[in-house]
């Protein structure tokens, strides 16, 4: 089952990753270096999707920068296939599933005098299920409320404050949001959750609710990168990967993150009896991507050099802000009950062999299905 996931995994932006750029992990490193001591959390698939959508309306070097920045090699697949791939993916992801909540979407908020090209609006709606809204940016507070209310409604109140402030000189703001909450295939026992120490740094210790469950997990020890990796399956198709670097080795692991590394982990997983201790947490990441993407070569679109002639025929239009917010909740609930305390004793021999894995210091996490839905670093749960 895990092997199948490796074969299906699209670690790049979508169906056509190229070796020139590892968009997901380059973006992770850019975010990590911008705020080394902070938690990081974002959705590579969601950001890739919104950039691909933007490329629909971009021309010349602006389009090229976006596609190359995403690591796409369009010799291998046509642009049409790229957008169709995302359309299909979006339909799959937004399909209602038992015990699986996922809201993913894009929207374009444009100044009242910006005339959008009909072809762009209809392609955006058809391929990316995206909405466009005329917005009075001069009234910053009103515009911010309009955008935040829209996202709150789309995520059923799970993301309520996408924007914290807004530039009244904005012309086009692109928002991209994703919320995820799913049930574990096997739940953690509520009774087993206890307050424990979490070592943010060697000097800073915080108390966190630590969930625990003994079970068979996909597990590996990566000696090259000095970390332990455990896979915890969600109901349905998704799996959470939690990566615990050895003490002081976080940066080494971060530097080693790549498509190749992830594929290797998924391939090398072995079932292992583990006593797993994992903090119960909700993690979110909110990013002004116009500040980060230029370091990945995607810059034109946010400057006066932008060619967005496919979006609007106004010659001086550029994307003022591109805002991404990702939210995930991690708690005990599963689709089937964790083994009751009494039952555990039937695994007496296995228990003797079981290893204790305690996530009580900063760790990394992925949520993958056929794509990397999320990637993050939990510095402080």
């Amino acid at each position: 089952e895990m092997k199948k996931r490796v074969e299906d995994l699209h670690v790049g932006a979508t169906v056509a990753p190229s070796s020139r750029r590892d968009f997901t992990f380059d973006l992770y490193r850019a975010l990590a270096s911008a705020a080394p001591s902070q938690s990081i959390f974002f959705s590579p698939v969601s950001i890739s999707m919104s950039l691909a959508m933007l490329s629909l309306g971009a021309g010349s070097s602006t389009k090229m920068q976006i596609l190359e920045g995403l690591g796409l090699n369009l010799q291998k697949s046509s642009e049409k296939e790229l957008h169709r791939g995302f359309q299909q993916l979006l339909q799959e992801l937004n399909q209602p599933r038992d015990g699986f909540q996922l809201s993913l979407g894009n929207a374009l908020f444009t100044d009242l005098v910006v005339d959008l090209q009909d072809t762009f609006v209809s392609a955006m709606k058809t391929l990316y299920l995206a909405d466009t809204f005329p917005t009075n940016f001069r009234d910053s507070a009103g515009a911010m409320k309009q955008i935040n209310d829209y996202v709150a409604k789309q995520t059923k109140g799970k993301i309520v404050d996408l924007l914290k402030n807004l530039d009244s000189n904005a012309v086009v703001i692109m928002v991209n949001y994703i919320f995820f909450k799913a049930k574990w295939e096997t739940s953690f026992n509520h009774k087993g959750t206890q307050e424990q120490d979490f070592y943010v740094t060697s000097e800073t210790v915080v108390r966190v609710p630590m969930m625990s469950r003994e079970d068979q997990y996909h597990y590996l020890l990566d000696r090259n990168l000095s970390c332990r990796v455990v896979g915890v399956p969600y109901q349905g198709n998704a799996t959470a990967l939690f990566i615990l670097p050895s003490e002081g080795k976080m940066q080494q692991v971060e530097n080693g993150l790549s498509e190749k590394t992830l594929r290797k982990w998924l391939k090398m997983f072995k079932k292992r009896q583990l006593e797993l201790y994992l903090p119960k947490f909700s993690i979110e990441g909110s990013y002004q991507l116009e500040k980060v993407l230029p370091s990945l070569g995607i810059s034109n679109v946010f400057t006066s050099h932008a060619d967005l002639s496919g979006i609007s025929n106004h010659s001086n239009i550029q994307v003022s802000e591109m805002v991404h917010k990702a939210v995930v909740e991690v708690d005990e609930s599963g689709t089937r009950a964790a083994a009751a305390t009494g039952t555990i004793f039937t695994f007496r021999s296995a228990r003797l062999n079981s290893q204790r894995l305690v996530f009580n210091r900063p760790f990394l996490m992925f949520i993958v299905d056929n794509n990397i839905l999320f990637l993050g670093k939990v510095n402080r749960p």
Partner: antibody, heavy 118, light 108 residues
Framework: EVKLLESGGGLVQPGGSLKFSCEAS????????MSWVRQAPGKGLEWIGE????????TYTSSLKDRFIISRDNAKNTVYLQMSKVRSEDTALYYC???????????WGQGTTLTVSS | DIVMTQSHKFMSTSVGDRVSITCKAS??????VAWYQQKPGQSPKLLIY???YRYTGVPDRFSGSGSGTDFTFTISSVQAEDLAVYYC??????????FGGGTKLEIK
């Protein structure tokens, strides 16, 4: 209910100075750009200038910027227009207005009159 | 400065008629044009902004159209209370945001 109440108009000699006040109520004053517009007797509307919510951006019609100063006090919900070296052609009804969108006032005061005469 | 020209100083119409007032900008202002109504002895009132957006509470008999340099304000069925001066204004480039000279609508 949104209200804008101008005051401070009157008769001034050429070369004199005057300060108009406009007190706002019924809305969150500190959130809005405010502007001044004038209308000479029997004539059309002329834009004077505008000020952003935190007073960091103030723009004027170029022909007036040397003599007119716009300011605001958010604690008092008031915007001001200070005029100096007034001329007879400054005789007009002066409106203060709240900006709804770029350069687009949605609420206007009733206006206060300046007459420049010796 | 961008010059806004309303070619008709006066227009005469009857109740129930459809009337259109035009405004020409000296340069491209995309869709950044507003229209105001000023009744005798009153302050101006915002009717339309960004060419075609009706301001809150404005009756739907008032509409606007155009883009670039040529703009039109239309009253689909004139009422007696529509007697007023109508001003166009560009809100594309400042300073200053400039107004047209006004068109006085008279009811026959």
């Amino acid at each position: 209910e949104v209200k804008l109440l101008e005051s401070g108009g009157g008769l001034v000699q050429p070369g004199g100075s005057l300060k108009f006040s406009c007190e706002a109520s019924g809305f969150d004053f500190s959130r809005y750009w405010m502007s001044w517009v004038r209308q000479a007797p029997g004539k059309g509307l002329e834009w004077i200038g505008e000020i952003n919510p935190d007073s960091s951006t103030i723009t004027y019609t170029s022909s007036l910027k040397d003599r007119f100063i716009i300011s605001r006090d958010n604690a008092k919900n008031t915007v001001y227009l200070q005029m100096s070296k007034v001329r007879s052609e400054d005789t007009a009804l002066y409106y203060c207005a709240r900006l709804f969108y770029y350069g687009t006032p949605d609420y206007w005061g009733q206006g206060t009159t300046l007459t420049v005469s010796s | 400065d961008i010059v806004m020209t309303q070619s008709h100083k006066f227009m005469s119409t009857s109740v129930g008629d459809r009337v259109s007032i035009t405004c020409k900008a000296s340069q491209d202002v995309i869709k950044a044009v507003a229209w105001y109504q000023q009744k005798p002895g009153q302050s101006p009132k915002l009717l339309i902004y960004s060419t075609s957006y009706r301001y809150t509470g404005v009756p739907d008999r008032f509409s606007g159209s155009g883009s670039g340099t040529d703009f039109t304000f239309t009253i689909s069925s004139v009422q007696a209370e529509d007697l007023a001066v109508y001003y166009c204004q560009q809100h594309y480039s400042s300073p200053p945001w400039t107004f047209g000279g006004g068109t006085k609508l008279e009811i026959k």
